[in-house]
């Protein structure tokens, strides 16, 4: 079901041990309860308990306190599960009955007699807070509290939103109190199936398949995939886009491996002569008076 109407019986008082018809129970009123929950009616009428019904075993004789019990027969609070959107309004009929028969299944006994009944009609929002009430008539008093809570994995003000924590290839999320998804750390997207990449990971040049990862697309490198990879054979050059080879000053050729500044890089001219570059690896030395040779070394 999507939700549960819970009714906690707390105390029933019938000091004179009387039935609704004015007769007394012998030796005492062995009391069980029938609960009928239905849609809101301005005037409560007989008919099906559209939201559910439940009966208790015998809970005591005449006047008694009802203890909480989590399981088995005589469970308290009583549970009335429903499988629809909670409408926010309800009608509740609580009847106290005397049985001369079986303690555990008094419902089936012949000769049961009504002690008293109460009817509650009104609005009730889904929530964890118990609403406490007490009803009196001339002979009896019943103290009780009630609430509506959502079943596991149902959320929202009418228990109509289904959500269950997930952590697999189709999503990584947990559920908010209203049933909306809350992505686990490192994930984003409507289904929380999109990893949040390493902070700073280049939006176009990098991607990730798990959080805090940065995988570079072809042609890019570096921790954040923001450095291009130059052409494979590029020697003295850089790139601004992948596979480019933009030559450093003094270098030329397709792979920037041709020395355009041999003079500076190698200082081939001796004895104070002047060196002049003349194309890749080309140079000429102009000798001072008194020197000769290709490098003015003589």
């Amino acid at each position: 079901g999507s939700g549960i109407f819970q009714l906690r019986l707390q105390e029933f008082v019938n000091q004179r041990g009387m039935l609704a018809n004015g007769q007394s129970c012998e030796p005492g009123c062995r009391t069980f309860f029938r609960i009928c929950l239905k849609h809101f009616q301005a005037t409560f009428s007989e008919g099906p308990c559209t939201f559910g019904n439940v009966s208790t075993p015998v809970l005591g004789t005449n006047s008694f306190v009802v203890r909480d019990k989590n399981s088995g027969s005589g469970r308290n609070p009583l549970q009335l599960p429903f499988n629809f959107t909670w409408p926010g309004t309800f009608s509740l009929n609580i009847q106290a009955w005397h049985t001369p028969g079986d303690d555990l299944r008094p419902e089936t006994s012949p000769g049961n007699s009504l002690i008293s009944q109460i009817i509650i009609q009104g609005s009730l929002a889904v929530g964890k807070i118990w609403r406490t009430d007490e009803q009196n008539d001339t002979l009896t008093r019943l103290s009780y509290s009630y609430r509506v809570i959502c079943s596991d994995n149902y959320y929202g003000e009418s228990c109509s939103r289904l959500c269950k924590k997930r952590d697999d290839h189709f999503g990584h999320y947990e559920c908010q109190p209203d049933g909306s998804l809350s992505c686990l750390p490192g994930w984003t997207g409507k289904y929380c199936d999109q990893p949040i990449c390493l902070s700073g990971c280049h939006e176009q040049n990098g991607y990730c398949s798990k959080p805090d990862e940065c995988i570079c697309r072809p042609g890019w490198q570096g921790r954040l995939c923001n450095e291009c990879i130059p052409h494979n054979g590029c020697r003295h050059g850089t790139c601004s886009i992948p596979w480019q080879c933009a030559c450093d000053e003094g270098w030329g050729g397709l792979f920037c491996d041709q020395d355009l500044n041999y003079c500076t890089h190698h200082s081939p001219c001796k004895n104070g002569s002047t060196c002049s570059n003349s194309g890749p690896k080309g140079y000429t030395c102009t000798c001072l008076p008194g020197y000769t040779g290709e490098h003015c070394e003589l």
């Epitope: 994995n153 997930r166 290839h169 409507k190 289904y191 199936d193 999109q194 990893p195």
Partner: nanobody
């Protein structure tokens, strides 16, 4: 409600290729992840591949580099291109779409049989 219909399975020799298709009818949006799972006889159903928002793809280690998942949003269809098939790829292949917010209600296709002979 979403209905899924797989096709493209069959018998193929080891090393061969197949292309599976999964057509979705119903309310499928581009941001809904779609995926493929498989179940070999006597084994648990296992994840194969999925494709999510922004075409983010995930693969099981056993199929990485051999299988490619893709989707055509206009046709509400997801594909699984399977190359270099091995006998251990023999299984019923299921297409799946997640139910928003709850894994117990994921939508599954009927499955298509893939048999790889050696």
């Amino acid at each position: 409600q979403v209905q899924l219909q797989e096709s493209g399975g069959g018998l193929v020799q080891a090393g061969g290729s197949l292309r599976l298709s999964c057509a979705a009818s119903g309310n499928i949006s581009v941001w809904i992840p779609m995926g493929w799972y498989r179940q070999a006889p006597g084994k648990e159903r296992e994840f194969v591949a999925s494709i999510g928002e922004g075409s983010t793809t995930y693969y099981a280690d056993s199929v990485k580099g051999r299988f490619t998942i893709s989707r055509d949003n206009a046709k509400n269809t997801v594909y699984l291109q399977m190359n270099s098939l091995k006998p251990e790829d023999t299984a019923v292949y299921y297409c799946a779409v997640p139910y928003y917010g709850h894994s117990d209600y994921d939508y599954w296709g009927q499955g298509t049989q893939v048999t790889v002979s050696s």
